[in-house]
């Protein structure tokens, strides 16, 4: 077959080819930020000629053009400046209201490099209607100016802009407009991952929050974010595998779907996951009717087995057939469970469609969506039972209109997105499901998104101050108890002056709590082995502090999961009947276990906990420490089996002031405390300028750095004695 010519450069940009210069290969142009390619792509035809999708005239030279944002077409009851036909990247538009009207939304908006305005639609409202003035987004025209119950407004976009959101909205009895705000956007615009992740995540969390048959919510509360521990969710993942998706992109689709599956199983809800890949025909890799669809490892393995070559004989994009296979699955499940049963009616359904283009065969996908809505009996009362997320990737041949038509429309939520590339998709799925905003005491949740603060990443982390100076660190293990090190308390038992500083979303300095009660392990005595030539001994270096008040759970304050508890068992998704030994085997399951602790400046630092034979060689180094242990004959006199050991190779060493802080691991997007920082042979902070400066030990240092952490699996009897009525412990 002939190959296509190679004279396809774009001035100021680059291009990629999905299948080289061969027929069927898709050439995709990209430009630096703030510019967009025109045309966006070309397809190599079997004749050996390049064709530009959607183009009517002959092949023109590809160029990078400046991105612009749409201008307001009309702005009611106020004025905007400057008045331009469209706005350059970085350009601002400002809004002011006439007397008697109050500005809602953003008074100043800036054009972003993706062709989208930042902020929110500015509206001048006098509060006269049953519903608030729905406003007119930039570039849109609205018909309908009455905002009473039952009134409707319609929107269209000017010139060549594309409408996403609802083209028609109705003022509902609860004073809220139906559907979702319409936005007019340039056909070449796309969404930034940092905008999509929270939008998608909020909507998804809402939907998960509703996954609870016993929960009654007032309609006016909207869909409250509240992850519950019961109810059932069917999640259908649809992955486009058509010709225009390169094999590498398909791998990222798979990886993103795996992230999603991993994350969804980290929620404490019952979930079944279906996996469908599609091109000209759909292929069901996992059905919700299969019991394995409830098992994360099985779902992930069916995803891993998804093969790009499965669809090489039919390379079109048949989105209708993919959605129809979801409909058929639902139909079978309904027949199986019985149409009238609660078991069927209380299942929530979420469909995530990952595609890179418009459907080009099999009929309108909207028809399949209509069938799905019908079988699930979706009406205003049951609107929460179905969410369809349509995610276009690649901004080349993605059809905004089609995505918008497929995505659900819910007030204050978005369900249709276009991302620049598969890397952006991966980023979104990494950060979208953020449980950290929950107000209940769900444990071990940290915000992992790139723009989260240190305290949001490790919200269990607290600072302990005896007077003015910070001394030690600790970890919230419930809303009123902190776990820390005993050696922090060496002034007898007067803790009236001590304070515990806990994260607080309202203040970057946190919030101070008094200590109601300090429970210091009676076994701790730093001088216990002085007569054996062991000048400092840290066995039983553990303490619990009961705070004078309960901590309000937030993004900045939340307990970490303690292994061997039911709370941790749920987070690990382990079966009921699991034991403490099972948790130890799952969490400390290698010779070298990657773990973390929190530095003085709040950042998360990495260590490796040495287990088994590696523990022995890790601890052995202590014999070289002649000052603290002048005549040590047996290392185990100092490093008992109560300690975990780290500090080899590239590990960071904790500073003295980091004592008592959690040593923790991440599993399934949740965090588990396995130890607490106790003592070490090297202090990287000693004499430093401030909390941000740490010195690495010179390679020649004798003894080399080693750090020892109290192993919580070895402190179970003591923990159970004092926390038995606070946490639910598993059998040993």
């Amino acid at each position: 077959a002939p190959s296509c010519p190679q004279n396809v450069n774009i001035s100021g940009g680059t291009f990629t080819l999905s299948h080289g210069w061969a027929p069927g290969s898709l050439l995709t142009y990209s430009c630096p930020q703030g510019l967009y390619p025109s045309p966006a792509s070309r397809l190599c035809k079997s004749s050996g000629q390049w064709q530009t999708p959607g183009a009517t005239r002959s092949l023109s030279k590809a160029v990078c053009k400046p991105v612009r944002c749409p201008a307001p077409v009309s702005f009611e009851n106020g004025i905007y400046t400057p008045r331009l036909g469209s706005y350059p990247v970085g350009g601002n538009v400002s809004f002011e209201c006439e007397d008697g009207f109050i500005l809602r939304g953003s008074p100043v908006r800036q054009c972003r490099p993706n062709g989208m305005w930042d902020g929110e639609t500015a509206v001048c409202d006098n509060g006269a209607g049953h519903c608030p003035n729905p406003g007119i987004s930039l570039g849109a025209v609205r018909t309908g100016f009455r905002f009473g119950h039952g009134d409707k407004v319609r929107y269209r976009c000017s010139s060549n802009l594309v409408l996403t959101g609802s083209s028609e909205r109705e003022c509902q009895g609860n004073g809220v407009w139906s559907g979702t705000e319409p936005i007019c956007r340039q056909p070449y615009s796309y969404d930034f991952p940092e905008d999509v992740a929270p939008a998608l995540g909020t909507s998804f969390s809402h939907m998960l929050g509703a996954t609870n048959p016993t929960q009654k919510t007032k309609e006016s509360l909207g869909r409250k974010i509240q992850i519950q521990r019961s109810g059932h969710l069917n999640l259908y993942l649809l992955l486009d595998c058509s010709q225009s998706v390169s094999e590498n992109d398909f791998l990222i689709f798979k990886e993103s779907a795996s992230l999603m599956v991993d994350r969804i199983f980290s929620f404490e809800i019952n979930v079944s996951v279906a996996i469908i890949t599609f091109a000209s025909e759909p292929k069901v890799l996992m059905s919700v009717l299969n019991d394995n669809s409830r098992d994360m490892t099985e779902v992930i393995s069916s995803l891993e087995n998804a093969n790009y070559k499965d669809h090489e004989n039919g390379t079109g994009t048949n989105t209708y057939a993919a959605l129809n296979s979801v409909y058929l699955m639902m139909n079978n499940q309904m027949r199986l469970l019985g149409m009238e049963t609660m078991a069927w009616q209380e299942i929530r359904h979420a469909i995530i469609l990952l595609t890179d283009g418009k459907s080009n065969m099999g009929g309108s996908p909207k028809t399949a969506v209509d069938h799905i809505r019908e079988i699930l009996n979706i009406n205003q009362k049951r609107n929460d039972y179905l969410d369809i997320y349509a995610i276009g990737v690649g901004k080349l041949d993605v059809d905004w209109r089609e995505l918008n038509e497929l995505g659900s429309k819910k007030d204050g939520e978005r369900h249709a997105f276009i991302l620049q590339d598969t890397k952006a998709l991966h980023q979104v799925f990494e950060h979208m499901l953020d449980v950290s905003k929950l107000t209940d005491t769900i444990c071990g949740v940290g915000n992992m998104s790139a723009n989260a603060s240190d305290q949001e990443r490790t919200p269990w982390h607290v600072t302990i101050k005896p007077k003015s100076q910070e001394t030690c660190r600790g970890a919230l293990i419930s809303d009123q108890w902190v776990l820390t090190a005993a050696h922090c308390f060496r002034d007898g038992n007067d803790h009236s002056l001590w304070r515990v500083n806990v994260g607080d979303p309202k203040s970057q300095w946190g919030k101070e709590f008094l200590i109601e009660k300090a429970v210091i392990s009676p076994g701790f005595d730093v001088f216990a082995k002085k007569n054996q030539g062991i000048l400092e001994f840290y066995g039983d270096d553990i303490a619990l502090l009961k705070l004078a008040q309960k901590v309000k759970m937030s993004t900045h304050a939340r307990p970490i999961c303690l292994p061997c508890t039911m709370e941790a068992n749920l987070a690990l998704r382990r079966p009921q009947g699991s034991t403490c030994r099972d948790h130890e085997n799952e969490l400390l399951n290698k010779q070298s276990v990657p773990a973390h602790f929190v530095a003085l400046n709040g950042s998360k630092l990495n260590i490796n906990l040495k287990m088994g034979v590696e523990w022995t060689s890790c601890a052995e180094v202590v014999s070289q420490e002649k000052t603290m242990f002048p005549n040590l004959t047996d290392v185990r006199e100092v490093v008992t089996d109560q300690f975990l050991c780290s500090g080899t190779q590239e590990d960071e060493s904790p500073c003295k002031g980091e004592s008592g802080g959690a040593v923790f691991l991440e599993r399934r997007f949740r965090f588990f405390q396995v130890g607490l920082v106790s003592w070490g042979l090297y202090n990287p902070c000693l004499g430093s300028a401030d909390k941000n400066s740490r010195k690495r030990a010179p390679r020649s240092k004798v003894p080399p750095p080693r750090d020892f952490h109290i192993n919580l699996f070895r402190m179970q009897p003591w923990l159970r004695q004092h926390l038995g009525d606070v946490l639910n412990f598993l059998p040993l």
Epitope: R490, C655, N683, L686, S688, A689, K691
Partner: nanobody
Framework: QVQLVESGGGLVQPGGSLRLSCSAS????????MGWFRQAPGKEREFVAS????????EYADSVKGRFTISRDNSKNTVYLQMNSLRAEDTAVYYC???????????????WGQGTLVTVSS
């Protein structure tokens, strides 16, 4: 907070010895890590040595290791710095410091003495 007063500084020849003392007021002395810092004219204040609240562990800057020894006597609320084999570059004002955590971060230290001058010169 602990009040600290240094003494023992003076003029000494290269190769000579000197013993600095730092006396602390306050019944909580035994709970604090104690340390010595020094500041040469026109230079930053730098860490010299520290001793743990137990007296069981000591730390030294590489530049003084093997020549200086830090010790404490909790019954006298005093910490000492024995300086041997003194060199011209040891010339500085020596400060005593108390720190509850043991990190001796310069930005956080609030218990300092007024300093004692050590001059090493022939």
């Amino acid at each position: 907070q602990v009040q600290l007063v240094e003494s023992g500084g003076g003029l000494v020849q290269p190769g000579g010895s000197l013993r600095l003392s730092c006396s602390a007021s306050g019944h909580t002395f035994r709970s604090y890590y104690m340390g010595w810092f020094r500041q040469a004219p026109g230079k930053e204040r730098e860490f010299v040595a520290s001793i743990s609240w137990t007296g069981g562990s000591t730390e030294y800057a590489d530049s003084v290791k093997g020549r200086f020894t830090i010790s404490r006597d909790n019954s006298k609320n005093t910490v000492y710095l024995q300086m041997n084999s003194l060199r011209a570059e040891d010339t500085a004002v020596y400060y005593c410091a108390a720190d509850y955590s043991g990190d001796f971060l310069l930005s956080d230290l609030d218990s300092w003495g007024q300093g004692t001058l050590v001059t090493v010169s022939s």
